[in-house]
Amino acid sequence: LPAQVAFTPYAPEPGSTCRLREYYDQTAQMCCSKCSPGQHAKVFCTKTSDTVCDSCEDSTYTQLWNWVPECLSCGSRCSSDQVETQACTREQNRICTCRPGWYCALSKQEGCRLCAPLRKCRPGFGVARPGTETSDVVCKPCAPGTFSNTTSSTDICRPHQICNVVAIPGNASMDAVCTSTSPTRSMAPGAVHLPQPVSTRSQHTQPTPEPSTAPSTSFLLPMGPSPPAEGSTGD
């Protein structure tokens, strides 16, 4: 004959554990039912009666099978630099993530505690590493033969256009200006494949960035309470 199924509450056999979705109540010394996600234990079990569960109230939740006396409070509303990617329900906490153009500077178990704006590389500097959900943009100075004329958290250094006749040589923050009606090769931002900067470097007279744009090592420091780093802007 199959073993008789025990209904909660029941005393476990010596050395055995309670079944899935049950817990051992130390006071009653019985295996008792857990409450399902979205509920909490309103009345704990006794030797003769099982756990009494009740639904979580508004703005509270339980995500797991549990026997907690009170549901957990949902986190506070998302701040203005965040978006709510998961709403507060009886079964899950609110999750706030950083809105586009921001990254998570201080994460928590789920979502983000503190968002910070992505660093923007100023003209003469391009993005060396794009920002991610959890890391800031890294800027680098534009190498000879390349330029960036924008203040942007996404723009890379682009090669100067090649001119038949150069009116104004390009520098780190400005494209070359051609005298002829059209350049030999235009490096429009919309071009699908940009040639390697190295392939154009020997064709440009521009030396290393002028002293006014050459970075100090401070451009490498992450932005924080200190002033914006050289090569980046907090705007």
């Epitope: 100075p141 996404t154 699908v192 900067p197 190295v198 050459a214």
Partner: antibody, heavy 118, light 107 residues
Amino acid sequence: EVQLVESGGGLVKPGGSLRLSCAASGFTFSNAWMGWVRQAPEKGLEWVGQIKDKSNNYPTYYAESVKGRFTISRDDSKNTLYLQMNSLKTEDTAVYYCTTYGDFFDYWGQGTLVTVSS
Amino acid sequence: DIQMTQSPSSLSASVGDRVTITCRASEDIYNALAWYQQKPGKVPKLLLYNANSLHTGVPSRFSGSGSGTDYTLTISSLQPEDFATYFCQQYYDHPLTFGQGTKLEIK
């Protein structure tokens, strides 16, 4: 957790072709810059090339040693990076690593071995 | 192309030692330098970027310094797990280039 898994390596004769794939997960692939770095047996690291993201119009860059023979592409809908290698030479023999996140590399795949030999 | 030259090519040291590895670029790379550690049969691991920024999860005994063309990686007190090969890499300009590597061995 960021994961990069390369596949497609193997033995190929000089002049032959091979296509490597890199399946990415654990991060927003479409925003990431992806690249390939190789390492010949018992040698140092050599950058092969990279492809940047859509916001930069997917520019590609290559090492001089592979330019014209290798092509990097990506399929953001499949979270996959590709390296098409044509006109292979014996000196292309190496472990090829898929990398991310920029002009320096936070994450690396385990690598796939490409052997070019007659 | 920007050439990266590392020295020494190999180095013997003991646990607890302070070790310095240098990397010289053929032209100014404006601190656009990364350092990697690679153990035999393993994948390279990023240690530092921007010459002196410690990557997430890297122990503070690793530090970087330098500017212009000359850069150093310092390990303040060698641990057994630090014996490996170290590479520098410039990302100022394409093509991105690596140093030839420095093998750090147990004395």
